[in-house]
Interface confidence: medium
């Protein structure tokens, strides 16, 4: 018996330890979202048993204080789904001492009538005006730089209409440096992690996408004002196409936004001579007057593989040459205005009808294959490059019916140390719960251990590879005390063990010869410290008569004394 | 029109280590493997191993495992070879071929690694 | 390793004649043969690939058959430009192997 999966949270996502008693599930949100709820649930033991608390959900804040802003974003209530009225909200954001701010626009979507978006260049609500959504109808493709370390966010609807509201990305940046650049439905590259001058950015878009606008390669300029040199491209769906990749998507223009009306877009798509292509057709929801048509061969005259309009849930086709025409033509009249409408069609090369469809490689990573040909219990295997882990899963197998046995995995950029683990005898200090960059662990000794190794490690990013600990995890050893150094006998005396060194804790036992009579403590201790030291001075044996005392004295006069006077174990 | 010229002849003393280029043109290089296939003095064809272009993943005849090291860089359109610690057994002119995972379509001319003190 | 025997090493023949390559692989392949041709001091030529797939370029009188452990190459009608030597390569596991080669030469 256990609880059931947790559900994940829209904007978020979670982790389970197990399902079964004891188990936990932790929760975490998107950047711009945030945790309502309790981050971190426990299976409890029962009949049926059943997670402690409710799951928590992921929302999109009506304001807050951003401090020590590096990289995020901030979303207006209900994105991408849309605001409600009535709002005023207010952020501040805050780089760290020393920095500036960037905000890329990713996108702004305001009711044409009272709703407002005002960023201002300071910490307040009279800060003058960077961006008024009032003043200004197009979105500056370049972003707005802050002249300090603050931008102040206003979002104002009211009491009509809405729309999807806006979410801004924001980034820090130093003195001498430029400002990460962002390019929405892509990806870069870059020469630098901190983009200095002469750093240069490579963009690329992901699948389905194509660059346009602004350049490919951009460099950063000008040692006494950085900037870079071009306007960052833009990724975009775009209505028509000719592909000749083993392996892509095709996607409804301007996906994930909903596509135009009066649109007729035609893909063509072409593999090698003798193979076939598989369409895994993932999201289709188009209206009820538009169409999308599958012509199997390389035009409109070709057979019709399959012709769909409205909703539809995820299925495949097959084609039986080596090009496909994809033809969508939406209604003039009408158009489907959601977020997510139109299509997502995935397609692959399948080189004969006894092996599973070619598997792309996947940016960040390579695949191996069990053996060359894809036939039925081949398995291919994905790995990341250093830095880069493996989201999904890494191993895919052809199944008796030519598809594979899980969905194509991607390489994710690896930014936080992995769990140093506890060290036996020491409790743990935590500076953030998912060892991102920049985290310290610290261990404490539990008492009577003393550590070994480095007590503070700190999460560093490395250039090539993962994300690394400063140093290995310490160890706390039992606290080892120095000995104390024998003491000799009393003259006329024994003394009880007669060894050189005496561990700490260990007890010694004094005794006098017949006729003397033992003056001071007959046990003494070696007290543990550092250094561990004897707890008394040593005995004497005094004579038990007179004559033998006088005589005894005279003695001790004559000699030297004694040099076991000396207490610490040190000497 | 796919074309792959390979690197210039080779002499080298036993021990010695050589690193022998591919560069491509004529087709996307990125989305491609290149092979790389041994052939002695009147002997048969032995498969080294490819390289996939694009994601720089590689596959290796056990056999050469150690002796022969893939490499590609993109913005060149380069694949190479680097065979190391060479005996006279390593004497053979080394084909690069594009292809798929599975057969060879366009063959370089050869580089011939002569092994000799 | 799968193994891929070639008959005869060498063949004698005239041209005009046709011609039949022999390729044994050492288990069951399906149909995961590619044949090859090496004229003298050249690189290898794809000629068929999947036992029977033509490669577009490749003159008509090339064919391909067989599939499980044995494959034959034909050529119908022989030309004095076929004289070369001929080899069968496997894709069904790894490593990719050769055989050793056929050797064509006119009578």
């Known amino acids: 018996l256990s609880c059931h999966f947790p559900r994940r949270p829209a904007y978020g996502d979670v982790t389970v330890t197990s399902l079964h008693p004891g188990g936990s599930a932790r929760f975490h949100c998107a950047t711009g979202y945030q945790l309502k709820g309790a981050r971190h649930l426990t299976c409890l033991n029962a009949t049926q048993p059943f997670w402690d608390s409710k799951e928590p959900v992921c929302i999109a804040a009506c304001g807050g204080v951003i401090r020590n802003a590096t990289t995020g974003r901030i979303v207006s209530p209900g994105f991408p789904g849309n605001y409600s009225n009535n709002l005023t909200c207010h952020w501040l954001l805050e780089a760290p001492e020393g920095q500036r701010l960037h905000l890329h626009f990713e996108k702004v979507s305001l009711a044409e009538d009272d709703d407002r978006l005002i960023i201002r260049n300071g910490d307040n609500v009279e800060a003058p005006p960077v961006y008024d959504s009032y003043e200004v109808e197009y979105l500056p493709i370049e972003g707005l730089l802050s002249s300090g370390k603050h931008f102040f966010v206003e979002l104002s609807t009211d009491s009509s209409g809405a729309a999807a509201g806006m979410a801004l990305r924001y980034e820090a940046f130093q003195q001498g440096h430029c400002y990460e650049p962002f390019v929405k439905y892509g990806n870069f590259s870059s020469s630098t992690p901190t983009y200095p001058v002469g750093t240069t950015v490579e963009f690329s878009c992901d699948p389905g996408y194509t660059l346009e606008q602004g350049s490919i390669i951009i460099e950063c300029v000008d040692p006494h004002d950085p900037q870079w040199n071009e306007t960052e491209p833009a990724c975009r769906a775009v209505c028509s196409g000719e592909i000749t990749d083993s392996a892509g998507v095709v996607l409804s223009p301007n996906w994930p936004e909903p596509y135009g009306r009066g649109q007729d877009c035609i893909w063509g798509v072409h593999v090698e001579e003798d193979k076939r292509i598989m369409l895994d057709i993932r999201v289709l929801r188009i209206g009820p007057g538009d169409v999308l048509t599958f012509y199997d061969g390389d035009d409109l005259t070709a057979r019709v593989l399959g012709q769909y309009s409205g909703p539809r849930s995820h299925f495949k086709l097959f084609t039986s040459m080596a090009d496909v025409t994809i033809q969508f033509q939406s209604d003039p009249g009408t158009s489907v205005l959601g977020y997510q409408q139109g299509f997502v069609i995935h397609f692959f090369e399948v080189p004969r009808n006894d092996t599973c469809p070619e598997l792309p490689e996947i940016p960040n990573g390579w695949k191996s294959p069990s053996q060359p040909e894809l036939v039925h219990g081949t398995v291919v295997t994905y790995q990341c490059y250093p830095g880069y882990q493996v989201v999904g899963s890494s191993v895919l197998m052809c199944q008796w019916d030519l598809t594979w046995s899980e969905d194509l995995p991607s390489c994710q950029r690896v930014t936080s140390c992995h769990d140093p683990g506890d060290v036996e005898h020491s409790r743990r200090l935590i500076s953030s719960p998912k060892f991102p960059v920049g985290a310290t662990v610290q261990y404490i000794c539990d008492q009577g251990f003393v550590l070994m190794g480095s007590s503070i490690l700190t999460c560093h990013d490395r250039q090539a590879g993962s994300p690394k600990w400063s140093d290995r995890a310490p160890k706390c050893l039992l606290e080892q005390l120095k000995p104390c150094h024998g003491l000799s006998a009393p003259e006329n005396g024994a003394r009880s063990p007669e060894k050189q060194l005496h561990p700490a804790g260990a007890t010694i036992h004094f005794s006098c010869a017949p006729g003397y009579v033992l003056k001071g403590q007959a046990s003494i201790k070696c007290v543990p410290g550092h250094p561990s030291h004897w707890s008394d001075p040593p005995p004497i044996c005094r004579a038990a008569s007179l004559d033998g005392f006088y005589n005894s004295r005279s003695l001790d006069v004559a000699k030297a004394p004694a040099a076991s006077s000396t207490l610490d174990a040190a000497h | 029109q796919v074309h792959l010229p390979q690197s210039r002849p080779e002499l080298v003393k036993p021990g010695a280590s050589v690193k022998i280029s591919c560069k491509a043109s004529?087709?996307?290089?990125?989305?491609?493997?290149i092979h790389w296939v041994k052939q002695r003095p009147g002997q048969g064809l032995e498969w080294i191993g490819y390289?996939?272009?694009?994601?720089?993943?590689?596959t290796y005849n056990q056999k050469f495992k150690g002796k022969a090291s893939l490499t590609a860089d993109n913005p060149s359109s380069t694949a190479y070879m680097h065979l190391s610690s060479l005996t006279s057994e390593d004497s053979a002119i080394y084909f690069c071929?594009?292809?798929?995972?599975?057969?060879?379509?366009?063959w370089g001319a050869g580089t011939t690694v002569t092994v000799s003190s | 390793d799968i193994l891929l025997t070639q008959s005869p090493a060498i063949l004698s023949v005239s041209p005009g004649e046709g011609v039949s390559f022999s390729c044994r692989a050492s288990q069951s392949i399906g149909t995961s043969i590619h044949w090859y041709q090496q004229r003298t001091n050249g690189s290898p030529r794809l000629l068929i690939k999947y036992a029977s797939e033509s490669i577009s370029g490749i003159p008509s009188r090339f064919s391909g058959s067989g599939s499980g452990t044995d494959f034959t190459l034909r050529i119908n009608s022989l030309e004095s430009e076929d004289i070369a030597d001929y080899y069968c390569?496997?894709?069904?596991?790894?490593?990719?192997?050769f055989g050793a080669g056929t050797k064509l030469e006119l009578k």
């Open positions: 390289i996939s272009s694009g994601s720089g993943g590689t």
């Open positions: 390569q496997q894709s069904n596991s790894w490593p990719l192997t």
């Open positions: 004529g087709y996307g290089f990125t989305r491609s493997y």
């Open positions: 071929a594009r292809g798929g995972v599975r057969y060879f379509d366009v």
